[in-house]
């Protein structure tokens, strides 16, 4: 499964919101019930946010993250990180599993 993220780092100012873009190409007949979406800190694998069994499982990252639920069915797995802090800087991995799976990492820089 191909998962796309921007090659360039996402740059955000402290205190603002950042969108970590991630997308995949759903096959015809794709249902959200089939989707496992896991956002993690790339190096430690710490859970950030997840979607499974047709439901948003919520933020595991200081309650400052959100998905775009209305866009998931179209293959938009992007993550919104609110009130960015200096400590948020680093790499986030978007892991998507339907029948097959794939993952890609996006870098966040805090200015």
């Amino acid at each position: 499964l191909e998962v796309q993220v921007p090659e360039d780092p996402v740059v955000a100012l402290v205190g603002t919101d950042a969108t970590l873009c991630c997308s995949f190409s759903p096959e015809p007949g794709f249902s959200l019930a089939q989707l496992n979406l896991i956002w993690q800190l790339t190096d430690t694998k710490q859970l950030v946010h997840s979607f499974a069994e047709g439901q948003d499982q919520g933020s595991a990252y200081a309650n400052r993250t959100a998905l775009f639920p209305d866009l998931l069915a179209q293959g938009n797995a992007s993550l919104r990180l609110q009130r960015v802090r200096v400590a948020d800087e680093g790499s986030f991995t978007c892991f998507v599993s339907i029948r097959d799976f794939g993952s890609a990492a996006v870098s966040l820089q805090v200015a």
């Epitope: 191909e2 998962v3 796309q4 496992n36 896991i38 694998k45 859970l47 499974a52 069994e53």
Partner: antibody
């Protein structure tokens, strides 16, 4: 459907370097996936060694980090493991596997014995 | 690193019986971050369950996973002859990814 196949010497001398290659077929190694090495020994069970992404980014198990190198050759659709300064404790079945979280599929595994 | 402890070490059952395998993690993890594998002699492990309860492609529905926090369970509702094997749990909520030591399900 992706298939993996390990290859390399089955016998390595103590203090030498273990070198294995994993050939990927049925799909491109350049896709959005991490490629891993896992080993299995009677003493330590299943142990993750490390992973590589097609960009060349690597992550290694802290316990093996000082001795491990994983590389990727996209032109040959394969990735490789090098483990140096081996001892008898490195005797194990070595598997390659795909995945950032869970592992699927796996290669069939290759037994590497460290002995003089 | 997170240590996974599986119990029992060996489970002796007859075909048709129900098998219940336990996996305990040394730290609490989200259920979405646990997988189960089956391994038969001379073969590589095969993914059975991911996300604690989602069956991998081609896995029969007699296999089911459940649990949360530190306690997870793999259940096989009615053992078939081909189910006698070793089963491993694995966590991917913390690096390095780690496995349990395995539970052997053998024919009684």
């Amino acid at each position: 459907q992706v298939q993996l196949q390990e290859s390399g010497p089955g016998l390595v001398k103590p203090s030498g370097t273990l070198s294995l290659t994993c050939a990927v077929s049925g799909g491109s190694i350049s896709t959005s996936n991490y490629w891993n090495w896992v080993r299995q020994s009677p003493g330590k069970g299943l142990e993750w060694i490390g992973e590589i992404y097609p960009t060349g980014n690597t992550n290694y198990s802290p316990s093996l980090k000082s001795r491990v190198t994983i590389s990727i050759d996209k032109s040959k659709n394969q990735f490789s493991l090098k483990l140096n300064s081996v001892t008898a404790a490195d005797t194990a079945v070595y598997y390659c596997a795909r995945g950032y979280n869970w592992f699927d599929p796996w290669g069939q595994g290759t037994l590497v014995t460290v002995s003089s | 690193e997170i240590v996974l402890t599986q119990s029992p070490g060996t489970l002796s059952l007859s075909p048709g019986e129900r098998a219940t395998l336990s996996c305990r993690t040394s730290q609490s993890i989200n259920a979405i971050l646990l997988a189960w594998y089956q391994q038969k002699p001379g073969q590589a492990p095969r993914l059975l369950i991911y996300g604690a309860s989602s069956r991998a492609t081609g896995i029969p529905d007699r296999f089911s996973g459940s649990g949360s926090g530190t306690d997870f369970t793999l259940s096989i509702s009615r053992l078939e002859p081909e189910d006698f094997a070793v089963y491993y749990c694995q966590q991917y909520g913390s690096s390095p990814r780690t496995f349990g030591q395995g539970t052997k399900v053998e024919i009684k």
